[in-house]
Amino acid sequence: KSSNEATNITPKHNMKAFLDELKAENIKKFLYNFTQIPHLAGTEQNFQLAKQIQSQWKEFGLDSVELAHYDVLLSYPNKTHPNYISIINEDGNEIFNTSLFEPPPPGYENVSDIVPPFSAFSPQGMPEGDLVYVNYARTEDFFKLERDMKINCSGKIVIARYGKVFRGNKVKNAQLAGAKGVILYSDPADYFAPGVKSYPDGWNLPGGGVQRGNILNLNGAGDPLTPGYPANEYAYRRGIAEAVGLPSIPVHPIGYYDAQKLLEKMGGSAPPDSSWRGSLKVPYNVGPGFTGNFSTQKVKMHIHSTNEVTRIYNVIGTLRGAVEPDRYVILGGHRDSWVFGGIDPQSGAAVVHEIVRSFGTLKKEGWRPRRTILFASWDAEEFGLLGSTEWAEENSRLLQERGVAYINADSSIEGNYTLRVDCTPLMYSLVHNLTKELKSPDEGFEGKSLYESWTKKSPSPEFSGMPRISKLGSGNDFEVFFQRLGIASGRARYTKNWETNKFSGYPLYHSVYETYELVEKFYDPMFKYHLTVAQVRGGMVFELANSIVLPFDCRDYAVVLRKYADKIYSISMKHPQEMKTYSVSFDSLFSAVKNFTEIASKFSERLQDFDKSNPIVLRMMNDQLMFLERAFIDPLGLPDRPFYRHVIYAPSSHNKYAGESFPGIYDALFDIESKVDPSKAWGEVKRQIYVAAFTVQAAAETLSEVA
C-alpha cells in the first residue's frame, strides 16, 4: 500500500509532498544559524539554542515542544590553569611545551568561549616518565608490544595516534597495560588526505589542529553518576569513585606539529612493521624513552580539568498520530558541539530542522501521520550520549511498549562520495525501496536513482547489485534505543571513498576548524548532499510513521542470522581440538536460526494475505513486527555490560564505533588461547551459545501465529 492511504488525506499529502517541501537553501540557512558561536554542552549558549529550536519547532507547527533537563556529570578544562604537555630535562626544566589552543580560523579570531583541546573526563594529574609509542592503541597493538616485542608499558606515558577505534578504547587499553598517562595525536597519515590543502584553503587538518573528545568507557550507562536511571531532581548520585566509565590516568590530545616534537626524539625499539609508521618525518620508534642524546629527558603531563554536575537540555517535539498515537517513530540528533559544530552535529541538526519544517507544513494543511512522530534535539552527546540516554531512561516504559523505530540524525556528511547506511536488518528493504525512488546527487549519475549510484560506489560484499549496509555499532545517540531497549534503529549520511579509514572520521573532526565555511566551501557548496540525506532520513521517518503495514521485513533478519551464525562458528572452529575436548556444539544455534528462517518466511506470507481492513488484525501483525527487535533483548545484558542487552548486536569490546554480531559468543572466544583456565573459558563459550540459541528461538516464536 502507498503511504497516502494511511490516513484519510488527500493524495497531495503523500511522501512526494513531504519530500518536495525539503529545500537545500533552507538547510544551508539553518546550518549557518547553528554554527556562528560554540554550543558546548552545559553552557548558556547551548541552552539559548535549545530555546530557539523549541520556539522554531512550535512555529513550524508541531503539537508540542518541551525541554527535558537533566543534571549530569560533564568535564571542562580549568580556565586559569591550562592543560599542556612538556619535555623536561634532567633538572626538571620545561624545554618544550605543547600549544594551549588551536590558532582560530579566519573570521573567528574574536569569538569567545572556544574550549581549548582536551580529553573530556580525564582525571587531574602531572605524571612524568618515558614515552612509549603504541600505534593506534588497539588491542592488537598492545598484543604486539607486550607479547611479541616484550615491551612493558607499566609506569610509562604512552603516545597513540587517533583513528581506527574509539578513543575511549585506546585509553582503556593503555590503563590495562599499566600506563600512567596517555597522549593522543592526529597523524597526517590518518587526517591529511594527499593532494588537499589544510584549512582554511582546503579540508585537511593543519598542524595546530586538534581533535577533542570524551574518553569514557560507559558501555551504554549514560550519566556516570546515575546508571540505569534518569539524572533528575531527586536522583541519588554515586560518589566519583564509583562513577561508571571514568578513566583513571591523565589523557590529553595534541596536533601533529606538537606530536612531531615528541616523536622525533624517540629511541628504543624500531617499529615492528610499516603499519606502525605514520606520515611524519620521524622514525616511529616505539621506545621506551628518547634516543641517546636525549635519554635523560622525560615527558610531563599537566592536566587540571574538572568534572562537574551540570544541567543539560533536550528539546522534544511531538507530532501526534491520527490513527495510532501510541506508536512512536523517533527522529533524533544532537545539538551540542565541541566548538562550532560545522559538521558534527549541526549538519545533522540543520537537516532535522528542515524535516520538522516540512512535516509542519503538511500538518498546517490538515495532514497528520498515522503514527506519532517524536523529534529530538539531544544535549551532551559529545560527553557520552548523555541527553538521549537520560531521556530514554526516564521514558523507558513508554518506549519499550510504544517505540516503533528510531532514526539517528548526527552529521549529515563525513564526505561527499556516496551514501552510508547502518541499520537493523528490519529496515534493509525500506532503505532499498526508498533510495530507488530518490534522485542521486552524484556527478555522473544525473537522472539516475540514489540506489544506483550508492550500489555502484559502495557495493555489498555479499550480494551483487545491492549496496553495502553496515551493522549498527555505537558512538551515537541511537545506542540506548537499539542496544538497550531493542527499538529498530537506523542512520544515514554521505561519506567519503575511504573504506580503510572508516572509524577515523574526517580530517577536521572535533577541531576548531569544523566551521560553516568548511561545509559551504569544500564539502557541499550546493547543499545537494545535505538535501539527499534529508530525503533519506525524512523519507524513512515518513514511511515508518505513515505506512499501514510497518515497512519491516523479518526475512532479512533471517538472512543475516545465518551469516552471523556461520561467522561465529568459523571463529570457534579455529580451535577444533578444544571444541572436541569440551564438547562445544553450535547445533542449538543452527537449529534456532533454521527455525527463525522458516517462521519468518511463513509470517511474511501471512503478511501479504491478511485483511488489512480489519484494524485488530492489522494492529496484531504490526505489533509482531514492532516487537521483533525487542525480542532480541536479554534482560540480563551482556557479561559486564548490563546496558548492552541486544544479543545479536553490540558495540565491539575493542572499538565502540564498530558493531559486533553475536557479541556474547565473540567475546567469550576472543583470545581464548591465552586464558589461564581453558575449561572455564570454553564453558563460557557454551553458555553464550545457549543464550544466543535461546534468544533466536524465542524471537522466532514471536512471529508464529498467536494461537
Partner: nanobody
Framework: QVQLQESGGGSVQAGGSLRLSCTAP????????MSWFRQAPGKEREWVAG????????SYADTVKGRFTISQDNAKNTMFLQMNSLKPEDTAIYYC????????????????????WGQGTQVTVSS
C-alpha cells in the same frame, strides 16, 4: 590452526581419470563448506565444485558437470573430487578451500578470514 592437505594430482592422458582428496584434520563435526578451485597458467582462479558437508548439498561449474563428482567422508573430514573424462583444458593447479559454516552453499563472500586454502595439487592432462 587447521591445515588442509591435498593429494591425488598427477599427469594423465585425455579421457583418463584422477581422484583428488582434501583433508581438514581436526575438524570435529560436519558443518563446513568444502570446495575445489583451479587455476590454469595465465588464467584467473575458477571455482569447480563444492559441498556443504552438513546438509550434503553439492554444486558444480557448468564446465565440469557430468564429468566430475564431489563426495565426502565425514569420519575422516575428507572431501574427494572424482574427475572422469579429463580434457587438456582441465590442466591446472587444483586448490581445496574450506569454510567452517552450516548455512552456506558457497564460500562466504567478503569474509576471507573465514576461508582456509590448501597449497594446491597439479593436474596435467595431455592429448
Amino acid at each position: 590452526q587447521v591445515q588442509l592437505q591435498e593429494s591425488g594430482g598427477g599427469s594423465v592422458q585425455a579421457g583418463g581419470s584422477l581422484r583428488l582428496s582434501c583433508t581438514a584434520p581436526g575438524y570435529t563435526d560436519s558443518n563446513y563448506y568444502m570446495s575445489w578451485f583451479r587455476q590454469a597458467p595465465g588464467k584467473e582462479r575458477e571455482w569447480v565444485a563444492g559441498v556443504n558437508t552438513g546438509r550434503g548439498s553439492t554444486s558444480y561449474a557448468d564446465t565440469v558437470k557430468g564429468r566430475f563428482t564431489i563426495s565426502q567422508d565425514n569420519a575422516k573430514n575428507t572431501m574427494f573430487l572424482q574427475m572422469n573424462s579429463l580434457k587438456p583444458e582441465d590442466t591446472a593447479i587444483y586448490y581445496c578451500a574450506v569454510a567452517a559454516c552450516h548455512f552456506c552453499d558457497s564460500l562466504p563472500k567478503g569474509q576471507d578470514e573465514q576461508i582456509l586454502w590448501g597449497q594446491g595439487t597439479q593436474v596435467t592432462v595431455s592429448s
